[in-house]
């Protein structure tokens, strides 16, 4: 498949698979206890370089936080240390290790007689939120072509379920804040805009809660507008042409234009011995223009048949729409069919079949826009 | 209000060749892409391509690749689909489709949904 | 490419049932899926995308489930201008496929 600019557009590299669902450890500790996390190395090989997260975030090492490449200990954890712990490759992102940490109120070796309420918080059945892929949770940055549509997810487990709840710049994001709306999916952890326009722009953040903790994402949406213009046309067409005398030539020009565009080719001309009439815009002829039954394609190339010396100088494709002109413009340089054809000397000349590109600074510094009221003063000249 | 309408269908012989167009309106052209459908008489739907103009990026079906080509005028708010080297399977009402994608960092496809569609253009491929 | 198998091909139903259509996707689509109506003569309309979001104007009697590889259409009030053909398409695969369609008449 080709890929286009409608190609989504991401902030991280390829995505690498991580630890099944079934492989995250959910743990319990209590107010005050160490938080000990061990990772050893997959297979028993060697581990490289990783780095410890915490819901989505990495860890920073301190005098409470000591963080090793197979072990992460949290000291004198208290219930801010609940969350969603992950090990990753630091190269590759791969997740090793996921834990859910839930940090009790009460001491983990607490003798809490009312065993059957505990029963229902505590042990691998219970715990704060994490994300059923965290490996997928990576990219942040979503662009989007205007009137496209864009869905956030946010996969989530935890015991009990966790509830979901999105922010638009920090704030409560309702379906009122937009036109059009939006569409929550609870049990696919999604909110959907169709049609998105440039106000959407902005940072989204899925909070996903529950009373053991709760762990947050941020997404970053563009929406990338296509803003009116006039024409481009592409670079180095049309092109410098030597011919010989006689001969045939074209001249290409490729216009791209969103709004309907309109092509003419120009042929320089000399009026009374000067190229530029009193207001400065240079003399020009229009040698093709659109008419009932051109088209876009035969606008883009002007063919010159058995060229003679009048023929040479300089060519002009314009291109105009509502938004404004653009030209480029190319030379032709004519030689004699008997003369002997010898490489460029020195001072520059040009020979048969080669296209040399003459530049700004040899057309004297200045190239003339032909507005289109230049257009309209010079045509018949 | 959103139109899409295909002209350009007729019958045509094997080997032959042929270019529907499908003019859109009513929305801006540049930010959605236009999908090909067929339709063989009495048949189900088949997909055929897809190109978003503001790129020219294009998708085929196998089925066609090779013989047919997508393309895009911006500045006509057209798109069209050459058909060459036509074969009588080929035979089909054609239908173009505006068609937007729904963009998702959690996976990595993007969806596309095809949500307006022409009134369709017979194709008849016969000696 | 990805093989989607509608269920059942055709079925008979009074204006006021229920309805339930399914397609099966050979491999895993995620939520990848849109559903078709399609009336003779006319071109297809689009009812459902990602499974189960219904797309605007479509009326709220059409519903749509699933993910993976099975997936649900229904149409909880069966109205007159219901009779018709309906499709399934996933787009998560290249090419994007459709089911063979199945046709709801009057009965």
């Known amino acids: 498949e080709s890929l286009g600019t409608e190609q989504r557009v991401v902030g991280r590299a390829a995505e690498v698979p991580g630890p099944e669902p079934g492989q995250q450890e959910q743990l319990v500790f209590g107010s005050g206890d160490a938080v000990e996390l061990s990772c050893p190395p997959p297979g028993g090989g060697p581990m490289g370089p990783t780095v410890w997260v915490k819901d989505g975030t990495g860890l920073v090492p301190s005098e409470r936080v000591l963080v090793g490449p197979q072990r992460l200990q949290v000291l004198n954890a208290s219930h801010e240390d609940s969350g969603a712990y992950s090990c990753r490759q630091r190269l590759t992102q791969r997740v090793l290790c996921h834990f859910s940490v839930r940090v009790t109120d009460a001491p983990s070796s607490g003798d809490d007689e009312d065993g059957e309420d505990e029963a229902e918080d505590t042990g691998v059945d219970t715990g704060a939120p994490y994300w059923t892929r965290p490996e997928r949770m990576d990219k942040k940055l979503l662009a989007v072509p205007a009137a496209n549509t864009v869905r956030f997810r946010c996969p989530a487990a935890g015991n009990p379920t966790p509830s979901i709840s999105w922010l638009k710049n920090g704030r409560e994001f309702r379906g009122e804040h937009r036109i059009g709306g939006i569409k929550l999916r609870h049990q696919q952890w999604s909110l959907v805009m169709e049609s998105v326009v440039p106000s959407d722009r902005g940072n989204y953040t899925c909070v996903v809660e529950n009373k053991f903790g709760s762990i947050r994402q941020t997404y970053t949406l563009d929406v990338l507008e296509r803003s009116p213009h006039r024409p481009i046309l592409q670079a180095g067409l049309p092109a410098n042409q030597t011919a010989v005398l006689g001969s045939d030539v074209e001249f290409h020009c490729k216009v791209y234009s969103d709004a309907q565009p309109h092509i003419q080719w120009l042929k320089h001309v000399e009026v009374n011995g000067s190229k530029v009439g009193p207001d400065g815009t240079p003399y020009v002829t229009v040698l093709k223009t659109a008419g009932a039954n051109t088209t876009d394609k035969e606008l883009e190339v002007l063919s010159l048949h058995n060229v003679t010396f009048e023929d040479a100088g300089e060519y002009t494709c314009l291109a105009g729409n509502s938004i404004g002109f653009s030209h480029h413009s190319a030379w032709l340089v004519v030689l004699p069919a008997e003369e002997e054809l010898v490489e460029a000397d020195e001072a520059g000349s040009v020979y048969a079949g080669e296209q040399k590109l003459i530049s700004e600074e040899d057309l004297g510094g200045e190239q003339k826009l032909i507005s289109e009221e230049d257009l309209h003063h010079h045509h018949h000249h | 209000e959103v139109q899409l309408v295909e002209s350009g269908g007729g019958l045509v012989q094997p080997g032959g060749s042929l270019r529907l167009s499908c003019a859109a309106s009513?929305?801006?052209?540049?930010?959605?892409?236009i999908s090909w459908v067929r339709q063989a008489p009495g048949k189900g739907l088949e997909w055929v391509g897809r190109?978003?103009?503001?790129?020219?990026?294009?998708n085929y079906a196998d089925s066609v690749k090779g013989r047919f080509t997508i393309s895009a005028d911006t500045s006509k708010n057209t798109a069209y689909l050459q058909m060459n080297s036509l074969r009588a399977e080929d035979t089909a009402v054609y239908y173009c489709?505006?068609?937007?994608?729904?963009?998702?960092?959690?996976?990595?496809?993007?969806?596309?949904?095809?949500?307006?569609w022409g009134q369709g253009t017979l194709v008849t491929v016969s000696s | 490419d990805i093989q989607m198998t509608q269920s059942p091909s055709s079925l008979s139903a009074s204006v006021g049932d229920r309805v339930t259509i399914t397609c099966r996707a050979s491999?895993?689509?995620?939520?990848?899926l849109a559903w078709y109506k399609q009336k003779p003569g006319k071109a297809p309309k689009l009812l459902i995308y990602?499974?189960?979001f219904l797309y605007s104007g479509v009326p709220s009697r059409f519903s749509g489930s699933g993910s993976g590889t099975d997936f649900t259409l229904t149409i909880s009030s069966l109205q007159p201008e219901d009779f018709a053909t309906y499709y399934c398409?996933?787009?998560?695969?290249?090419?994007?496929?459709f089911g063979q369609g199945t046709k709801v008449e009057i009965k």
């Open positions: 489709a505006r068609t937007y994608g729904i963009y998702d960092l959690y996976v990595d496809y993007t969806e596309y949904v095809m949500d307006y």
């Open positions: 190109i978003y103009p503001t790129s020219g990026s294009t």
């Open positions: 398409q996933q787009s998560t695969g290249h090419p994007q496929t």
């Open positions: 009513g929305f801006t052209f540049t930010s959605t892409g």
């Open positions: 990602s499974a189960s």
């Open positions: 491999q895993d689509v995620d939520t990848s």
